[in-house]
């Protein structure tokens, strides 16, 4: 269930968050979502340049996802199949972000309501969008412009995996514990 908006609003950062989207859903092996140079989307066991993503709030509760290395936006066809596009199409490439209580997030196509899933290992023509939402844990990537602050031992602000640390997402969103980079 999405968390009720009971936490104080977090006042730092802008609207882009650099993240790896990790999933360990039962229907596939543990994987990081990656957007490849040829526009295909898949999962990689380890973090890679192709799996470093920028999650950006477009409007409250809705984000776009950009592959940093490939400059391709994550998009979804009406059948649920994922692809990476150099051209941002609001209809195909906007995702509603739902933050779950356990720190995982669920992403749904804003246009079709279909959940975001990594393609399975089976034939690409079978079951491109399995039923039930896939859960992703947004893991921090290095900030794109700023170097990592040296050895911070104090607790980090609990933004965290949200693409939207300023609570720019919808009114009933919570926060996820993949701590801010």
């Amino acid at each position: 269930h999405p968390i009720p908006d009971s936490s104080p609003l977090l006042q730092f950062g802008g609207q882009v968050r650099q993240r790896y989207l990790y999933t360990d859903d039962a229907q596939q092996t543990e994987a990081h979502l990656e957007i490849r140079e040829d526009g295909t989307v898949g999962g990689a066991a380890d973090q890679s340049p192709e799996s470093l993503l920028q999650l950006k709030a477009l409007k409250p509760g809705v984000i776009q996802i950009l592959g940093v290395k490939t400059s391709r936006f994550l998009c979804q066809r009406p059948d649920g199949a994922l692809y990476g596009s150099l051209h941002f199409d609001p209809e195909a490439c906007s995702f509603r972000e739902l933050l779950l209580e356990d720190g995982y997030n669920v992403y749904q196509s804003e246009a079709h309501g279909l959940p975001l899933h990594l393609p399975g290992n089976k034939s690409p023509h079978r079951d491109p969008a399995p039923r039930g939402p896939a859960r992703f844990l947004p893991l921090p990537g290095l900030p794109p412009a700023l170097p990592e602050p040296p050895g911070i031992l104090a607790p980090q602000p609990p933004d965290v995996g949200s693409s939207d640390p300023l609570s720019m997402v919808g009114p009933s969103q919570g926060r996820s514990p993949s701590y801010a980079s």
């Epitope: 609003l9 802008g14 882009v16 950006k56 477009l58 409007k59 776009q64 940093v68 412009a145 300023l166």
Partner: antibody, heavy 117, light 107 residues
Amino acid sequence: EVQLQQSGPELVKPGASVKIPCKASGYTFTDYYMGWVKQSHGKSLEWIGDINPNNGVTINNQNFKGKATLTVDKSSSTAYMELRSLASEDTAVYYCTRGYGGALDYWGQGTSVTVSS
Amino acid sequence: DIQMTQSPASLSASVGETVIITCRASENIYSYLAWYQQKQGKSPQLLVYNIRTLAEGVPSRFSGSGSGTQFSLKINSLQPEDFGSYYCQHHYDSPWTFGGGTKLEIK
């Protein structure tokens, strides 16, 4: 049709404050951020800040810290920007905008603010 | 803050010509660049965002390109209504900043 309706020109004295309204129509007010932009005469554009109409959370340009305060009234689908301690350099046209991922996809017609004694 | 530098500051062209306006960012802004058109005494209008996505209702003679720090707006077959000022803006991370503008005049 999306429309952002701003109020008419303002002539204010140095040191005074002014509050500019921007009434949104043609879309669901809480579905998009509202922003404000300054344009001094014959000059380029300066982003002042954005506000989330759902919760009133703002992102501000530090250059306008202490100068501009952004608020919303959800019941009337209206965004407001208050400018205080006005000085001659605040003379400009101020636009309200609808934000979409930082791009500004709709603009009000602008409110001219003239600071003069 | 990220600085946006536009060139040229002004240019003259004739109806039917093709023009290119360029914009440089002081650091990598990835795919987060927008272009606006402003006519005298009017509000700016969004033309392009995310480098190359045309805003609703914008004619296909406008096209954006570039990546990282270097970007351009191309206008094919200039029409009389295309004359005015053009601004680039990064929408990578706040504060969003604009270029100084390019004034496009009729030759």
